[in-house]
Interface confidence: low
């Protein structure tokens, strides 16, 4: 439905508060280095302009597209070339090329200082002094560090952030009330950002068809009582929402997401019995709740899949008439019967089925050719099952920290060219699969584990894409979205790698390690472990364990010493020498 003024349409639909918040997110995700005050100024100018268009949709420039309006505004930033270099060249382009250019310059790992949490009293004072600015600052800081964060969901996080401060700044023990809530928001936020990053990568690198296939599988698991046409409608609408958000069209995205939530709640009888509670909530909570809703119960007495997809004489006829519709039906029927499978496994099965039909429907006897297609699924199902079983056993044996270390060693040996911070970050996240998923019963382990691993490996892929250093990573990341995890799992030690030169500075530690949190101290030790493996890729588990145990003892001893700095200097030299001897460096 065409509107005379798109900016007026979105302002009216979303309301001023959400409009301003979403424009701030959009600008911060594009110009990640700009100071907060500059962004606030731009947002206020856009908002004032939008209000003139609401008053008179025929007013000058009100008929311009949002990309044109926002792009023009971003290109007024005076320091664009000094701050962003070649991104300034985007401003010489016309829409839609200009927006595409801005999108290509989004940085998944911007060079920004780590967010340091101030004292609780300082935060509460800032919150009370100027609540609006305090919350805008939150949106800005998250958006610029996570340029693909799902904008309507960030509004939900900001609402919870505000609620936490409203409640806890009045509490007797402010810190005890606030800090756990902020930790939870931080962890959930990182997870949400990573999940959305995979959706955007799926759309941008593999296309709409890949995203739609993922959505058919996931929604069919979640809504197994909904019929195929209903799932297809939801998939179409969901694809539009995510295409918009991933493309920087945040106002349209938030508006369409609200419409989708409304539709789902109005039609919950034909979608899922689990939506009732979600649909009673306010908009932001409702949308979040629907996105996280548990799988509905499977309908009783679902017939065998073989009848329609193997035994029927019409398989090739139906496939030929509408390939994607027929494959979509297959994926829907398989997924609604298998909430115990990961989405990526379901997509591998659908791909195998498609490949078989492509081959067999051209054969002399198609039915004879595809009759055993379901037998080809068995090894595909067993591979992730076995992998998860082995890794959960290892996790239960080692605990999270040591399990992460095992993965650090494993992945550093596979792809030693990758930067140490990236290997540490990715392996730590891979290791979290244990505490996240191994506690689940068998029926929930695979969807939890393998779909989580897809999200984490995508982090590796997007970080590596920025500065590619390993052909093996590039290959696993680009060949097939659904086979990324099996591709990385199959990598052996990189025999072509030339070990890194030994540098004693890398293994020199100071007393400041003693004041770090347990998590930060772990990261320091894990960084050293990655560096050790890069120096000695053929080191055995036993050798590495001995060195890491010595290292832990060294840190503990020096942190208890009276003269910590001297201890780190003297004992550190001994540790380096002993480690070199132990590893034959």
């Amino acid at each position: 439905d065409a509107h005379k003024s798109e900016v007026a349409h979105r302002f009216k639909d979303l309301g001023e508060e959400n409009f301003k918040a979403l424009v701030l997110i959009a600008f911060a995700q594009y110009l990640q280095q700009c100071p907060f005050e500059d962004h606030v100024k731009l947002v206020n100018e856009v908002t004032e302009f939008a209000k003139t268009c609401v008053a008179d949709e025929s007013a000058e420039n009100c008929d311009k597209s949002l990309h044109t309006l926002f792009g023009d505004k971003l290109c007024t930033v005076a320091t664009l070339r000094e701050t962003y270099g070649e991104m300034a060249d985007c401003c010489a382009k016309q829409e839609p090329e200009r927006n595409e250019c801005f999108l290509q310059h989004k940085d998944d790992n911007p060079n920004l200082p780590r967010l340091v949490r101030p004292e609780v009293d300082v935060m509460c004072t800032a919150f009370h002094d100027n609540e609006e600015t305090f919350l805008k600052k939150y949106l800005y800081e998250i958006a610029r560090r996570h340029p693909y964060f799902y904008a309507p969901e960030l509004l939900f996080f900001a609402k919870r952030y505000k609620a936490a401060f409203t409640e806890c700044c009045q509490a007797a023990d402010k810190a005890a009330c606030l800090l756990p809530k902020l930790d939870e928001l931080r962890d959930e936020g990182k997870a949400s950002s990573a999940k959305q990053r995979l959706k955007c990568a799926s759309l941008q690198k593999f296309g709409e068809r890949a995203f739609k296939a993922w959505a058919v599988a996931r929604l069919s698991q979640r809504f197994p009582k909904a019929e195929f046409a209903e799932v297809s409608k939801l998939v179409t609408d969901l694809t539009k929402v995510h295409t918009e958000c991933c493309h920087g069209d945040l106002l349209e995205c938030a508006d369409d997401r609200a419409d989708l939530a409304k539709y789902i709640c109005e039609n919950q009888d034909s979608i899922s019995s689990k939506l009732k509670e979600c649909c009673e909530k306010p908009l932001l909570e409702k949308s979040h709740c629907i996105a996280e809703v548990e799988n509905d119960e499977m309908p009783a007495d679902l017939p065998s899949l073989a009848a329609d997809f193997v035994e029927s004489k019409d398989v090739c006829k139906n496939y030929a008439e509408a390939k994607d519709v027929f494959l979509g039906m297959f994926l829907y029927e398989y997924a609604r019967r298998h909430p115990d499978y990961s989405v990526v496994l379901l997509l591998r099965l659908a791909k195998t089925y498609e490949t078989t039909l492509e081959k067999c429907c051209a054969a002399a006897d198609p039915h004879e050719c595809y009759a055993k297609v379901f037998d080809e699924f068995k090894p595909l199902v067993e591979e992730p099952q076995n992998l998860i079983k082995q890794n959960c056993e290892l996790f239960e044996q080692l605990g999270e920290y040591k399990f992460q270390n095992a993965l650090l060693v494993r992945y550093t040996k596979k792809v030693p060219q990758v930067s140490t911070p990236t290997l540490v970050e990715v392996s730590r996240n891979l290791g979290k699969v244990g505490s996240k998923c191994c506690k689940h019963p068998e029926a929930k382990r695979m969807p939890c584990a393998e779909d989580y691993l897809s999200v984490v490996l995508n982090q590796l892929c997007v970080l590596h894409e920025k500065t590619p250093v390993s052909d093996r990573v590039t290959k696993c990341c680009t060949e097939s979205l659904v086979n990324r995890r099996p591709c990385f799992s199959a990598l052996e030690v990189d025999e072509t790698y030339v070990p890194k030169e030994f540098n004693a500075e890398t293994f020199t530690f100071h007393a400041d390690i003693c004041t770090l949190s347990e998590k930060e101290r772990q990261i320091k030790k894990q960084t050293a472990l990655v560096e050790l493996v890069k120096h000695k890729p053929k080191a055995t588990k036993e050798q590495l364990k001995a060195v890491m145990d010595d290292f832990a003892a060294f840190v503990e001893k020096c942190c208890k010493a009276d003269d910590k700095e001297t201890c780190f200097a003297e004992e550190g030299k001994k540790l380096v020498a002993a480690s070199q001897a132990a590893l034959g460096l």
């Epitope: 019929e227 046409a229 297809s232 179409t236 509408a322 519709v325």
Partner: nanobody
């Protein structure tokens, strides 16, 4: 916009046959998921049969399977419902419904169809 106009209803004896037609204008019928629904006196709308847009994958309600056949003639931009072995419980107003655009499949959910004809009455009685 899609306009739909049903015809072919009437009075028929049990065991008899009727063929309903639905002429579409404003959009090609082969680009549209189309279906027949019916509404018996005092009851809600019930899905009868459907056919996907661009694909001849057909769907039937269990109560009509083997007796009714849905088809379309793209050159005439018309949808048909061939009804054989009619029973008194088939008495209802029959509606043709269209759902343009992707996904190009039919649905049993009446609310998903934005375009409807005005209906044609089928009475099965001796």
């Amino acid at each position: 916009e899609v306009q739909l106009l049903e015809s072919g209803g009437g009075l028929v004896q049990p065991g008899g046959s009727l063929r309903l037609s639905c002429a579409a204008s404003g959009r090609y019928i082969d680009e549209t998921a189309v279906a027949w629904f019916r509404q018996a006196p005092g009851k809600g709308r019930e899905f009868v049969a459907g056919i996907g847009g661009g694909v001849d994958i057909t769907y039937y309600a269990d109560s009509v399977k083997g007796r009714f056949t849905i088809s379309r003639d793209n050159s005439k931009n018309t949808l048909y419902l061939q009804m054989n072995s009619l029973r008194p419980e088939d008495t209802a107003v029959y509606y043709c419904a269209a759902r343009p655009g992707r996904p190009l499949i039919t649905s049993k959910v009446a609310e998903l169809y934005p375009y409807w004809g005005q209906g044609t009455l089928v009475t099965v009685s001796s």
